[in-house]
Each structure stands twice: as C-alpha cells, then as structure tokens.
C-alpha cells in the first residue's frame, strides 16, 4: 500500500512532469534559512494551488515566473491540464470523509476600485472554488476583520487571526488557508501519554505530553542523511512521515530534502516493530509569501512589473500580500483502538525485537496522500 502511494505521489502537487526546480523543498529551505531556530509548517499543495490560480490571471513574464517557480515548464495544452488537475485534486480533498477534517481554500480580497474580469472570477470559482471579495482597505481594521472572520468561518474556528496587521495601501490580498485533523488508523492509548523531556537544544529542555504506542510501522534508517523515518498512517489515504535526524544532523537532513529523497523513503520503507514515542502537539505556520517567493524566482507579481491583466483592466495592479496559514493537530485519536492496556508496555524481555524511537528533539514531518499536504519542522512542540 505504501508502494502504491509512491507511484501516485505528485510531489509539490505539480500535476505536470517536467520540472527544473524542486518547489516544495526550495520553499522549505527558504523558510528555514529565514528563521533557523523556528518551527516551520506549510502546505506545498495549498500554496502551489493558489499560485496556479493566480497564474490564471497573469500574463507574459509574470505567468512564466509563476509556472517556472512551481517547477513547471508548460506548453499551452498542458496549462489546461494543470488547472483541471488542481480542480480534481480540490474536489478530492474537500470530499467529506470519516475521521478526517480538511478545510482548504483560497480567496482574493480586492480594493473597491478594482474591477475584476468576469472570466477570471468564473475560472477561479469553477476550477479553484475560490471566492473574491470587494474590500475597503482604507479602513484597515475593518478589512482585517472581514478577512479574519471569513477564514475563521471557513475553518469552523480552527484558524483565527490569519492577519495580524494590514497595510491600508493594499490593493489585492490573496489568502490561502488549510486546516487538517485526521484520526490515525490505530489510536495511541491516552493512558500511555505522559510528560517527557524534549531537547529543543542540548541545553534547553522542555516538558511535552509524549504519546506512545508499540506497533508495526513503516520504518527506515537513512544512513546517508543520518536520520530515521517512520510512517504513521491516518484513516483513509494520508500518511504522516516523521523524520528524526541524528543529534546535530538537522541541517544535513534539511539540505538533503528533495522529491527524490521522499520517493526513496517511501519506496524503501520496511515494516518494523517499534516502540514509538511522539509528542502530542498542534503546529501552525503563517507566512507572508510575498516576502519568500521572490527567492524562488516568483517576484514580478508582487511588484509594479506585475502583469495581471487577466485579473483586472487596471494597469498598475499587483498582489500586495499573499498570506498562507497551515494548521495541524496531532493527538492520540484513532479509528481503531490501540491494543494497549493501562500499562504503557510489557517488560522489555518480552519485546527484544522491538526498537525504541523517541521524538524528543527537533524533527521533520510530512503529511502525504498523493501529494505533499504538509511539510514542517517541529522545533518546540
């Protein structure tokens, strides 16, 4: 079942094959270098989707920058396929599923003076299920409330305060949000969760609620990158991959992240009896993408050089802010009860073939289905 997932994996949600750049991992590295000691959390599929949506209204070099930045080298024919691919993906992701909460969406808030092209608005709605809202940015407090209330409503209160402040000179603000909470295929036993040490650095220890479960997991030791990788399946199609770098090797692992690495991990997984200890945590990442994407070659759209003639007839329109927020909760809940009792584990002699894997220092996580839904680094749960 993991092999099937490898074959179906569209890394970075790029539905077209010819790629010169590893968008997902380049973006990760850009975020990591901007804040080395911070946790990182974002949704490559969600950001790719909002950029592809933006490309609908972009022309000439602006469009080319977006598509190339995403790692795509498209002919006219495959551009249609790209948007159709995202449309299909969105429909799949938004399908209600048991034990699986996913709210993913895009919206465009535009100044009252901006007249949007009907073709763009309808393509946005049809292909990307995206909303557009006229907004009075002169009243920045009111505009911020409008945007935050909209996202809070769409995520049933799971994402609040998307924007912390707002420039009253804004003309176009793109928001992109994703919230995810799913049940594990097999739950962690609540009674096995207890406070444990988490080494933020070798000197800084914090206490975290540490979940535990002994089970068969997809596991591998990557000697090249000096890390251990474990796959924990969610109900349905998604799997969480947790990557524990050896001490002092986080940067080495980060530098080695690529589509090829991920495919290799998914292919090389072997079932292994593990005593797994994983912090219970909620992680979120909030990013002003207009500050980060230029380092990936996507810059025009945020400057006066933007060609967004497909969005509006206004000649001087540009995207003022592109805000992305991703939130995931990790707890014990599963669809199947764990086969554990009130004791944490049996005595060690009874499980000599079991290896202990403790996520008690900064680690990386992916959530994948056929795409990379999320990618993050947990520095401090």
């Amino acid at each position: 079942e993991m092999k099937k997932r490898v074959e179906d994996l569209h890394v970075g949600a790029t539905v077209a094959p010819s790629s010169r750049r590893d968008f997902t991992f380049d973006l990760y590295r850009a975020l990591a270098s901007a804040a080395p000691s911070q946790s990182i959390f974002f949704s490559p599929v969600s950001i790719s989707m909002s950029l592809a949506m933006l490309s609908l209204g972009a022309g000439s070099s602006t469009k080319m920058q977006i598509l190339e930045g995403l790692g795509l080298n498209l002919q006219k024919s495959s551009e249609k396929e790209l948007h159709r691919g995202f449309q299909q993906l969105l429909q799949e992701l938004n399908q209600p599923r048991d034990g699986f909460q996913l709210s993913l969406g895009n919206a465009l808030f535009t100044d009252l003076v901006v007249d949007l092209q009907d073709t763009f608005v309808s393509a946005m709605k049809t292909l990307y299920l995206a909303d557009t809202f006229p907004t009075n940015f002169r009243d920045s407090a009111g505009a911020m409330k409008q945007i935050n209330d909209y996202v809070a409503k769409q995520t049933k209160g799971k994402i609040v305060d998307l924007l912390k402040n707002l420039d009253s000179n804004a003309v176009v603000i793109m928001v992109n949000y994703i919230f995810f909470k799913a049940k594990w295929e097999t739950s962690f036993n609540h009674k096995g969760t207890q406070e444990q040490d988490f080494y933020v650095t070798s000197e800084t220890v914090v206490r975290v609620p540490m979940m535990s479960r002994e089970d068969q997991y997809h596991y591998l030791l990557d000697r090249n990158l000096s890390c251990r990788v474990v796959g924990v399946p969610y109900q349905g199609n998604a799997t969480a991959l947790f990557i524990l770098p050896s001490e002092g090797k986080m940067q080495q692992v980060e530098n080695g992240l690529s589509e090829k690495t991920l495919r290799k991990w998914l292919k090389m997984f072997k079932k292994r009896q593990l005593e797994l200890y994983l912090p219970k945590f909620s992680i979120e990442g909030s990013y002003q993408l207009e500050k980060v994407l230029p380092s990936l070659g996507i810059s025009n759209v945020f400057t006066s050089h933007a060609d967004l003639s497909g969005i509006s007839n206004h000649s001087n329109i540009q995207v003022s802010e592109m805000v992305h927020k991703a939130v995931v909760e990790v707890d014990e809940s599963g669809t199947r009860a764990a086969a554990a009792t009130g004791t944490i584990f049996t005595f060690r002699s009874a499980r000599l073939n079991s290896q202990r894997l403790v996520f008690n220092r900064p680690f990386l996580m992916f959530i994948v289905d056929n795409n990379i839904l999320f990618l993050g680094k947990v520095n401090r749960p």
């Epitope: 969760t193 207890q194 406070e195 040490d197 206490r207 944490i344 005595f347 060690r348 202990r356 403790v358």
Partner: antibody, heavy 119, light 106 residues
C-alpha cells in the same frame, strides 16, 4: 519484578558527605531515568533531581544544586545520590524512584534511606 | 518554579462520606499527579496524568482538572483511605509537590 533496593541508614557528622545507593532489579537502569526525593521528618516531599541514563543528562531543583550529585553505574545497575557539606537541615529520608519512557514515572520507589546529621 | 497549593492541609471524614482535595498551580500544567503515603511507608503513585488510576487503586477514587486547578475525589470514604495525599507536577523543571493533605477517618 521491578524493585529498587536502597542502602541502609546513615549517621553522619555536620560538614561531611554521604553517598546513598539504589540498586535496581527487574530492569536495566541504562534505559531509564532515576529520580531522588527528600522527606524531612513529619514534612512533605521535595524533588531533588533526576538523571537520564540514556544521555547522562541531569536536572536538579536549584535549591539542591551544589548540595546533591546524582550519578549511576550501569554495570552494577545502581543509582547514586551524593550529598555534601551536610547540616541538620539534611536530616531526612531520601527515596529513589524510577522514571523512563516505558513505565509510569514514579510508579516504583525504593524503601528510603534515613540520613541523620548529628555531631 | 511552579508552586502547588494543596487544601485543606488536614481533614477528617466519616466512612461513606465524599471527600475532595484540591491542588492549585501557579502556572498552567500539562497534567497533575497524585500520591498516597501512609506512615513509615514510601509514597505510592495513586492517580497519574490528572485522571488515570494507578494499578490497584480502588474505583472510588477519581481525579480531574485542567490548567491550574485540579482535584482528587473519594466518592465514599473508607478507613483504609486514611493517609497523606500529595499532588505533583512534572510539566516543567524543577518538579514540585504540594505540601500534602492529611486525611483522617472520623
């Protein structure tokens, strides 16, 4: 069966040092933590500190820093608590208690060692 | 460091009576833990992670709470429950104990 056997009572002079032992059976201390707790006569419990034998990391309550040193010998499966510059305030029963990932922390305690500091 | 304030310091209850001991913390905790200690014996883990009963603890005991406010409850007091009860936090270093509640039988 998990057991923690502590060394016998100690009568020591003020200013001296004492080293208490806690020998584990039924498990390897190298996979665990060991906590030490102080209880003065007719008083409550005070956490002194703990050692993580996996990486050697120790943590102490600041008020015991410099007074207490927690160590261990994995070959003899024994944890140690050394107390220095003893005063009458150090007269108490000292307990070791097991911690770790695969057990409930503080589910297993030694029987305690009474240390009496007297001239 | 987190200070735990237990109350009452001492109390007595008749057999069959409901007993509640409270413990409040100066900072929010992940969990609270409770120990029972009888004279001349080592403390015993009684309730762990706020609400889970340790092995062998009678079902008349329960624990609850969140944030900074926690309690241990005995639904119907029995003679064998007479002991001193301590709350403990392990949410941050240094770990700390409450000053104890001595529970006597009337």
């Amino acid at each position: 069966e998990v057991q923690l056997q502590q060394s016998g009572a100690e009568l020591v002079k003020p200013g001296a040092s004492v080293k208490l032992s806690c020998t584990a059976s039924g498990f390897d201390i190298k996979d665990t933590f060991m906590h030490w707790v102080k209880q003065r006569p007719e008083q409550g419990l005070e956490w002194i500190g703990r050692i993580d034998y996996v990486n050697g990391n120790t943590k102490y309550d600041p008020k015991f820093q410099g007074k207490a040193t927690i160590t261990g010998d994995t070959s003899s499966n024994t944890a140690y608590l050394q107390l220095s510059s003893l005063t009458s305030e150090d007269t108490a029963v000292y307990y070791c208690a097991r911690g770790g990932y695969d057990v409930r922390e503080f589910a297993y305690w030694g029987q305690g060692t009474l240390v009496t500091v007297s001239a | 460091q987190i200070v735990l304030t237990q109350s009452p310091a001492i109390m007595s209850a008749s057999p069959g009576e409901k007993v509640t001991i409270t413990c409040s913390a100066t900072s929010s905790l992940i969990y609270m833990h409770w120990f029972q200690q009888k004279p001349g014996s080592s403390p015993e883990l009684w309730i762990y992670s706020t609400s889970n009963l340790a092995s062998g603890v009678p079902a008349r005991f329960s624990g609850s709470g969140s944030g900074t406010s926690y309690s241990l409850t005995i639904s119907r007091m029995e003679a064998e429950d007479a002991a001193t009860y301590y709350c403990q936090q392990r949410s941050s270093y240094p770990f700390t104990f409450g000053s104890g509640t001595k529970l006597e039988i009337k």
